[in-house]
């Protein structure tokens, strides 16, 4: 039975040209995290594999940096970066947990962070 929950940074906003950290945290399970995939809609951004390290998709290599931790830093943000981002935790023996983050990239200098929320 999958008992874990994923806590994410929830709905967040950031300024165009700036950077943002996408962060998820898996809790309430003793399952071993083997890999975390970061995806934007249907596109793979990056993978953090417990054994191998990081694989950054070539399409994003100039704008994505690994970390902190299992998180992902998006740099040089554009309005086109607005949308849903998913952290997909591959665990053993539980299986897959998915967290969702919605990022809004703003033209203005007012960019407030949304509250954290949990996905069971």
């Amino acid at each position: 039975m999958m008992t874990g929950t994923i806590e994410t940074t929830g709905n967040i906003s950031a300024e165009k040209g700036g950077s943002i950290i996408l962060q998820c945290h898996l809790s309430s399970t003793t399952a071993q995290v083997t890999q975390v995939n970061w995806e934007q809609q249907d596109q793979l951004l990056a993978i953090c594999n417990a054994d191998l390290g990081w694989h950054i998709s070539p399409s994003f290599k100039d704008r994505v940096a690994p970390g902190p931790g299992l998180g992902l830093t998006l740099q040089s943000l554009t309005v086109n970066d607005t949308g849903e981002y998913f952290c997909i935790y591959h665990t053993y023996p539980d299986g897959t947990y998915t967290g969702r983050i919605f990022l809004e990239v703003l033209e203005s200098s007012v960019a407030e962070h949304g509250a954290r929320f949990q996905i069971p």
Epitope: T34, Q35, D42, Q43, L44, L45, N49, A50, D51, L52, G53, W54, H55, I56, S57, P58, S59, F60, K61, P66, G67
Partner: antibody
């Protein structure tokens, strides 16, 4: 010098078994994923199986799933491929190959490519 | 049949620039790293290009890789007779959880 040396190939009857070995030297074997790739006579390259540095993640091509088993012994710097229920279509030169991986001070990165290859060992399945 | 499609053959004269294409029937090239291998007659494959366009040390800058959408290309400029070989593109296919090679392109230097 980074080197991979395959052994264990030979002639085997259909339905038989064979175990290939790949001895690695010149690099820290336990830090790298490894793969087996084969090439049938006059044909192209076909990836067979891959294994992560610790052996915790293992992948197979559909064509060998359930028949072949990849493993590694990091203390012996050796990669293995146990091949059971062999078929005529398994006839090929089998190469072992080392995955590309680079490390900075803060992170290691992998690229899904293979930068060092052995010279191959021929497996012939025939009655 | 391979998920990655390459022309079976290509040719050029010494000094010429030749391009070999590699197209994907699925989305596996789109966000994945494409690698290129050269296999000279009777020898093991050699890595030419990794991560779309990176050259390992020792590979001449006459070889270059590029990618656009679901297609990748290997360009060889200043073609030489010793470039006559089979060339393979490859990538990791996340849907298959496996590494896939294109069918290979036999390059002939005329």
């Amino acid at each position: 010098e980074v080197q991979l040396l395959e052994s264990g190939g030979g002639l085997v009857q259909p339905g038989g078994s064979l175990r290939l070995s790949c001895a690695a030297s010149g690099f820290t074997f336990s830090n790298y994923a490894m793969s087996w790739v084969r090439q049938a006579p006059g044909k192209g390259l076909e990836w067979v199986s891959g294994i992560s540095p610790s052996g915790s993640s293992i992948y197979y091509a559909d064509s060998v799933q359930g028949r072949f088993t990849i493993s590694r012994d990091n203390s012996k710097n050796t990669l293995y491929l146990q091949m059971n229920s062999l078929r005529a279509e398994d006839t090929a030169v089998y190469y072992c190959a080392k995955a590309i991986r680079t490390c900075s001070l803060s992170h290691c990165y992998y690229y899904y490519g293979m930068d060092v290859w052995g010279q191959g060992t021929l497996v012939t399945v025939s009655s | 049949q391979s998920v990655l499609t390459q022309p079976p053959s290509a040719s050029g004269t010494p000094g010429q620039r030749v391009t070999i294409s590699c197209s994907s029937s699925s989305s596996n090239i789109g966000s994945n790293a494409v690698n290129w291998y050269q296999q000279l007659p009777g020898t093991a494959p050699k890595l030419l290009i990794y991560y779309d366009n990176q050259r390992p040390s020792g590979v001449p800058d006459r070889f270059s890789g590029s990618k656009s959408g679901t297609s990748a290309s290997l360009a060889i400029s200043g073609l030489r007779s010793e470039d006559e070989a089979d060339y393979y593109c490859a990538t990791w296919d996340y849907s298959l959880s496996g590494y896939v090679f294109g069918g290979g392109t036999k390059l002939t230097v005329l």
